[in-house]
Interface confidence: low
Amino acid sequence: DPVLCFTQYEESSGKCKGLLGGGVSVKDCCLNTAYAYQERNGGLCQPCRSPRWSLWSTWAPCSVTCSEGSQLRYRRCVGWNGQCSERVALGTLEWQLQACEDKQCCPEMGGWSDWGPWEPCSVTCSKGMRTRRRACDHPAPKCGGHCPGEAQESEACDTQQVCPTHGAWAAWGPWSPCSGSCHGGPHEPKETRSRTCSAPEPSQKPPGKPCPGPAYEHRKCTGLPPCPVAGGWGPWGPVSPCPVTCGLGQTIERRTCNRPVPQHGGPSCAGDATRTHICNTAVPCPVDGEWDLWGQWSTCVRRNMKSISCEEIPGQQSRWRTCKGRKFDGHRCTGQQQDIRHCYSIQHCPLKGSWSEWSTWGLCMPPCGPNPTRARQRLCTPLLPKYPPTVSMVEGQGEKNVTFWGRPLPRCEELQGQKLVVEEKRPCLHVPACKDPEEEKL
């Protein structure tokens, strides 16, 4: 049967450690005698070494909790493929028994003394409770024992006296209306409330105590609306300086709602706290220059040579661009006005060509006319000569890339009767009408 195989056996605990895996036989697991195995159903961990006695287990708890008892411990024959000694098979337990004593003596019950006298009643009128006590000392308990039952008992008692009724205030009545209508006047508004000594009234016989404290209460009114103060504008402040150095700008004047400040819910100032004015510097703003698009590359030539077309001779060509639109001391364009590169001229060179794959379909033409069509092409593409892609410059300038320039004359085998371009056309389907989107909004 397959077992769990482990790489270690812990002698002190008898546990398997370092799981190797499951689903192997005992025989395979125990090819290494340092290993250990365990049945799948959570059985005993067995070491793969030859059988011998395990360490003794810890002593079991003492059989009694007080006075002399006894306790057991065991060890087990563990291992694989054999036995611990003659007639001692794997799994056999060996026991040891010894005397033990957790506590020298056992607890002994004590006995109660007689009940003491009843204490006075807990109240001086009507009904209450009284208590009496006894001691656990006839005899005293031994070895942590105790006496059975309670050390005190209580019973009801009646003083035969009627209790006086002391006066207590009823709830306060509602506050009277306020004596004024807003805060901050010459007389601070007040409100008043009263209460009666009737919850309950004090008894006559035996005489009860009257209610303590006043029957009336005064306080300043709260929650009254304060007398409102409307806000008023202060004067306009100075005009801010024009914030621009050229063209038109905007200056601001400000005023504050503080003469007076609105108070106690009074209305704020009506109107705007700021007003703006246009300011004119009468100075035109500078316009920075911007590079126009690069011009066409010049013909690819080499100094002192009439023509280098179709030759493996690198030449040079340049292109120019202009800085447009700079006015009123604006920034000049940054960067180079001229661009120079190295080139091979293949202008009008007969080159072997090959047909390209079909291009993607183009747009439908005409987009708004009758019967629009779309087209795709295959082109006779020239195969460029395998000239060196870079040239070495004078020392310190390193390698420079060389670009092919010019329009060659590619030669391809005829395709559908054509030598340079084969075109395929298709009508466009379900064509919508062209309408001005602004008209559609109306």
Partner: nanobody
């Protein structure tokens, strides 16, 4: 801790099919083997099939060719497809997960699902 919950057991006629599922939750990243173990009334527990983390499978001779073990790691679920069921397949089927820890292995068990094959 790992929790295992089986489902899919029930009464089926001989020759019929059942599919058992075992949903695992908890510290499942350290599980290296999962297995189906069955216990027929009055008999010892018996390993039916097990599958390793990398998908290696083991079957008891009595179920080879009839039962298929599989696991869906995205759903943390173990399955046992049981075809051509026989009366002797009647048992409580337990899902078992074997977890690898640095200091030893731990076995986890589901509560079991009863499969009864009877006409």
């Amino acid at each position: 801790e790992v929790q295992l919950v089986e489902s899919g057991g029930g009464l089926v006629q001989p020759g019929g099919s059942l599919r058992l599922s075992c949903a695992a939750s908890g510290r499942i990243s350290s599980i290296i083997h999962m297995a189906w173990v069955r216990q027929a009334p009055g008999k010892q527990r018996e390993l039916v099939s097990e599958i390793s983390r990398v998908g290696t499978t083991v079957y008891a001779d009595s179920v080879k060719g009839r039962f298929t073990i599989s696991r869906d790691n995205s759903k943390n679920t173990l399955y046992l497809q049981m075809n051509s069921l026989r009366a002797e397949d009647t048992a409580v089927y337990y899902c078992n997960a074997l977890q690898y820890e640095k200091h030893g292995g731990a076995d986890y068990w589901g509560q079991g699902t009863l499969v009864t094959v009877s006409s």
